[in-house]
């Protein structure tokens, strides 16, 4: 029962996490214009992985896609790659985990196969979550670097008569969605790996042996219970699980709103 709950919860948490990773990847607000001392702006800029947008206080919003591949910063390409790898691994992990769920019966699938699939999906979720967290963190680091560079420019370039309004960007909502979603996927993956231990069957199950003593007929079963949770003390009878299939993370090598005032 505990195994089924752990596995089911792991699946649900991972599902929410992957949905969040997909949402974060598609969101336009990865970086948003820093409003610092002016909470009201006539023109508000924000950027995503795929397009940049401008929202005027008139309510007019215009978004432009990044129609170049080679002209984009390598870091942005890397973030895109990490997020896509995370989504792909997560999606495969979800597919595998559906068949691995203890509450779902598919033909005469053995517990060992389900355990293998549970571990595989768990590892996939963990890698997926790590990819998302890494992608979001790389983007955040890029933002922090650019923020301080543009801040330095703001205070050094004020000597002339004509000033340039330097647009600084700060963390957008997508970053927080990505971090949370990546964390949830990671947690879900860990839960699946924990559940897998409980699904792993024993190598031997001793038959009940009857010992007949004179006058009494006592039957007892030494070690005759199944270590269903995998946490029992009868390690002698438990199958040592070798980890099953392993997945490789193929990381490919490879920005800006109040009634939108």
């Amino acid at each position: 029962m505990a195994v089924t709950a752990c596995q089911g919860l792991g699946f649900v948490v991972s599902l929410i996490g992957i949905a969040g990773i997909i949402a974060a990847t598609c969101m336009d607000q990865w970086s948003t214009q820093d409003l610092y001392n002016n909470p009201v702006t006539a023109v508000f800029n924000y950027q995503g992985l795929w397009r940049s947008c401008v929202r005027e206080s008139s309510g007019f919003t215009e978004c432009r896609g990044y129609f170049t591949l080679l002209g984009l910063p390598a870091m942005l390409q890397a973030v895109r790659a990490l997020m896509i790898v995370g989504i792909v691994l997560g999606a495969i992990g979800l597919l595998v985990s559906i068949f691995a769920l203890k509450c779902i019966r598919i033909g005469s699938m053995e517990d060992s196969a389900k355990a293998n699939m549970t571990l595989t999906s768990g590892i996939m979720f963990i890698v997926s979550g790590l990819c998302a967290i890494a992608g979001v963190s790389v983007f955040a680091n890029m933002l922090v670097t650019n923020f301080w560079m543009s801040t330095a420019n703001m205070y050094t370039g004020m000597g002339g008569m004509v000033q340039t309004v330097q647009t600084r960007y700060t963390f957008g909502a997508a970053l927080f969605v990505g971090w949370v979603a990546g964390g949830l996927t990671l947690i879900g993956g860990v839960m699946m790996c924990i559940a897998c231990r409980g699904l792993a069957p024993e190598e031997t199950n001793y038959k009940a042996v009857s010992y007949h003593a004179s006058g009494h007929s006592v039957a007892y079963k030494p070690g005759g219970f199944k270590a269903s949770t995998g946490f029992g003390s009868n390690t002698k009878n438990k199958k040592i699980y070798d980890g099953g299939a392993r997945t490789e993370d193929e990381v490919q090598s490879y920005p800006s709103k109040h009634d939108y005032v």
């Epitope: 023109v43 432009r64 340039t164 309004v165 009634d259 005032v261």
Partner: antibody, heavy 118, light 113 residues
Framework: EVQLVQSGAEVKKPGASVKVSCKAS????????MHWVKQRPGQRLEWIGM????????NYNEKFKGKATLTLDKSASTAYMELSSLRSEDTAVYYC???????????WGQGTTVTVSS | DIVLTQSPDSLAVSLGERATINCKSS????????????LTWYQQKPGQPPKLLIY???TRESGVPDRFSGSGSGTDFTLTISSLQAEDVAVYYC?????????FGQGTKLEIK
């Protein structure tokens, strides 16, 4: 047809207050910011502030904070601007204007002349 | 606040001739996000409210004759009337539409020579 109709001219004594109205018609009142602009004779236009008819949120030019108060009556599709503690320098034509794409004012009221005289 | 300075203060041009009004901003009005210049031009005739002519520095408002055109980027902008008509006699204002508070130029009075 979009129309912004303002209240008539006002003559006030120094220290008094005046409330100018701007009735909108021909468009969805709650969808556009309403701005107020001041024009003194022979001087440049001055932006006073703005109000969003949907939320009631306002933003004022620092220069007019404490001088102008922007309010609305959503049901009547009317925006109001109240000017307090009137002085001779408040003598001007006041316009309401609707904000559109490009943060430009596409429709203006006909203007309300406020004269402050003792 | 952004300061807009128009030149000249007044201008007399013959009918059918080209009229050029300049507007200089103390800060760049170019938004990097969409590469648009947030400068607007208005025409105001005596006793009337201003009328929108051009926004985004060069986009003509619908219904505005094509003899009116706007150009420029960053801090320097120009309003051009290619062939002056009698009805174009008015005061012309440029407006910063990029940052609050919105500010206007002092105006250029256009007359017929």
């Amino acid at each position: 047809e979009v129309q912004l109709v303002q209240s008539g001219a006002e003559v006030k004594k120094p220290g008094a207050s005046v409330k100018v109205s701007c009735k909108a018609s021909g468009y969805t009142f709650t969808s556009y910011w309403m701005h107020w602009v001041k024009q003194r004779p022979g001087q440049r236009l001055e932006w006073i502030g703005m109000i969003h008819p949907n939320s009631g949120s306002t933003n004022y030019n620092e220069k007019f904070k404490g001088k102008a108060t922007l309010t609305l009556d959503k049901s009547a599709s009317t925006a109001y601007m109240e000017l307090s503690s009137l002085r001779s320098e408040d003598t001007a034509v006041y316009y309401c204007a609707r904000l559109k794409t490009g943060n430009s004012f596409d429709y203006w009221g006909q203007g309300t002349t406020v004269t402050v005289s003792s | 606040d952004i300061v807009l300075t128009q030149s000249p203060d007044s201008l007399a041009v013959s009918l059918g001739e080209r009229a050029t009004i300049n507007c200089k901003s103390s800060q760049s009005l170019l938004n990097s996000g969409n590469q648009k210049n947030y400068l607007t031009w208005y025409q105001q005739k005596p006793g009337q409210p201003p009328k929108l002519l051009i926004y985004w520095a060069s986009t003509r408002e619908s219904g505005v004759p094509d003899r009116f055109s706007g150009s420029g980027s960053g801090t320097d902008f120009t309003l051009t009337i290619s062939s002056l008509q009698a009805e174009d006699v008015a005061v012309y204002y440029c407006q910063n539409a990029y940052t609050y508070p919105f500010t206007f130029g002092q105006g250029t009075k256009l007359e017929i020579k």
